[in-house]
């Protein structure tokens, strides 16, 4: 029907609009006309795929006219100007405005020309990452929880560790109709060698410029682990007085050290110090195994050394341990 | 008070040509599309075509098969339809209607007979 | 072309009544359609655009609505000055085209 032309007319608008819950969005929607290519805008007309009518229309000689004036508003179509920009805002946007609309010239002499936009409706959740608190179960435990609160879509959740485990992760209503909250846990089995290391709880949305990275350091209970240290083997008689350590590791802290020997109280010689047994020079050899006993909340264990002093030949004067 | 005058009744014998004006106030006559619609008597509407009057570019319903002609004078915020060939069937009231992508100010109508 | 079969042809109604006159297209017109009145020895006169917007000065017994293939004037409560015919018609597409028109009596 038209006459040829130097070019057809366009509608440009993007494919996909995102627009936040509770936000105001712009759908764009131009004419673009070729440089020699005439043509005369009468209507601008959007409506919604799958109801009945059309929710805004701007007319060239009454104006506009909305389905729902307060929440929809023509940006840049005025009377008495040339209908070049269809662009409609979208106020107080609701879950249930997500769908795909279509934008529409009425045009002179090229007839109608439309163009159809996908609107998205987002909402930013809010993420919290905390540690779960463990003892030793023996059996796989979550140890870091990561929630990503009134996401739209649902955030996807991952988690980066060296300390294996695996995930688990749900996904239940958010609080705003239409949102999700993603609830997601790292489980493994507790060890000593876990507390204190650290997993990462990654979050991806649409909604944000780049993932959002939330650092877990892990905490696990568990009772002493123990050990002594000092002695080399190689503790002879007249050498300085020597000492040795009661190492202990352990979540919470240890709340006392015991030392003692297998023979019962500490002989003269050995002086305890806290985590240290202080080892005075002896006159004769003695072979004393001695017990280190480490307490904390969850409990109590101990380490056992023996200890041989040994006549020899002690040239030069360093003490019966280096340290 | 945007007014459409159209030219009076023509009657026209088989195979001649009729030429009909619409003559336009109250708006700016530049800014409208107008479009000629017919109706034989009793019957339904019928669209012809239009014409915008800045580069007056036009679009004509096939069906006319270049018997139609839509012109303007910008000088006179006028426009015209000129239908040639004419048949007994092209007897009808003639109307021009500014365009607002529907017809929203008409003309009074010109009643052409095409009669031997 | 888009055929547009409007119904019914004709139709007598009583003062105060409600009235509905429907538009059938041959093919999605999306909301391109406007219902007109037309008075006998008279032009019509455009009473809706945009399958359901009125036009300003148009009483609001008139009501359009639809889009796609279906739609449908009422008039919710019938008045004497209302006896006229009425016509449907699409601007979605080349050529333009219109019902063929339904014919109200007052009874």
């Known amino acids: 029907w038209p006459p040829p032309g130097t070019g057809d007319i366009i509608v440009q608008a993007p494919t996909q609009v995102p627009g936040f819950l509770g936000d105001s969005v712009t759908l764009p929607c131009y004419l673009q006309v070729p440089g020699m290519e005439e043509t005369h805008v009468s209507q601008l007309t959007w409506s919604r795929h799958g109801e009945s009518g059309s929710m805004a229309v701007f007319h060239q000689t009454q104006g506009p006219n909305y389905s729902e004036p307060k929440r929809l508003e023509f940006v840049a179509a005025r009377l008495g100007t040339e209908l070049r920009d269809a662009s409609l805002r979208m106020f107080g946007l609701r879950v249930e405005d997500e769908g795909n609309y279509t934008c529409l010239f009425v045009t002179f002499p090229q007839g109608s020309r439309s163009v159809d936009i996908w609107l998205r409706v987002l909402a930013k959740p809010q993420n919290t990452a905390e540690v779960q608190k463990v003892q030793l179960t023996g059996k796989p435990v979550p140890v870091a929880r990561c929630v990503s609160t009134g996401g739209r879509p649902p955030a996807h959740i991952t988690w980066h560790s060296d300390l294996g485990g695996m995930p688990n992760t749900s996904q239940a209503p958010g609080f705003l109709s239409g949102t999700v909250t993603v609830t997601s846990l790292w489980i493994l089995v507790p060890s000593s060698q876990v507390d204190g290391k650290s997993v990462t709880c990654k979050v991806e949305h649409e909604s944000f410029e780049k993932p959002q990275l939330l650092t877990v350091n892990l905490t696990v209970y568990y009772p002493p682990e123990v050990s002594i240290s000092g002695y080399d083997n190689n503790w002879y008689l007249s050498q300085n007085e020597a000492t040795l350590t009661c190492d202990a590791r352990s979540n919470p802290e240890p709340t006392g050290y015991n030392w003692s020997t297998t023979m019962g109280p500490l002989p003269p010689f050995a002086v305890a110090q806290g985590a240290q047994l202080l080892i005075r020079p002896v006159d004769k050899p003695i072979n004393t195994t001695f017990i280190c006993n480490v307490t904390n909340a969850l409990g109590a264990r101990q380490a056992e050394l023996t200890v041989q002093v040994k006549e020899g030949p002690p040239s030069e004067p360093s003490g019966m341990s280096s340290n | 008070e945007v007014q459409l005058v159209q030219s009076g009744s023509e009657l026209k014998k088989p195979g001649a040509s009729v030429k009909i004006s619409c003559k336009t106030s109250?708006?700016?006559?530049?800014?409208?599309?107008m479009h000629w619609v017919r109706q034989p008597h009793g019957k339904g509407l019928e669209w012809i075509g239009g014409i915008h009057p800045n580069q007056g570019e036009t679009s004509y319903n096939q069906r006319f098969k270049g018997r139609v002609t839509l012109t303007v004078d910008k000088s006179t915020s006028t426009a015209y339809m000129e239908l040639s060939s004419l048949r007994s069937e092209d007897t009808a009231v003639y109307y021009c209607?500014?365009?607002?992508?529907?017809?929203?100010?008409w003309g009074q109508g010109t009643l052409v007979t095409v009669s031997s | 072309d888009i055929v547009m079969t409007q119904s019914p042809s004709a139709m007598s109604a009583s003062v105060g009544d409600r009235v509905t006159i429907t538009c059938k297209a041959s093919q999605n017109v999306g909301t391109n359609v406007a219902w007109y009145q037309q008075k006998p020895g008279q032009p019509p006169k455009a009473l809706i655009y945009s399958a359901s917007y009125r036009y300003s000065g148009v009483p609001d017994r008139f009501t359009g609505s639809g889009s796609g293939t279906d739609f449908t004037l009422t008039i919710s409560s019938l008045q004497a000055e209302d006896l006229a015919e009425y016509f449907c018609?699409?601007?979605?597409?080349?050529?333009?085209?219109f019902g063929q028109g339904t014919k109200l009596e007052i009874k």
């Open positions: 109250g708006y700016t006559f530049t800014e409208y599309t």
């Open positions: 209607a500014r365009w607002t992508g529907d017809f929203d100010y």
């Open positions: 018609q699409q601007y979605e597409s080349y050529p333009y085209t």
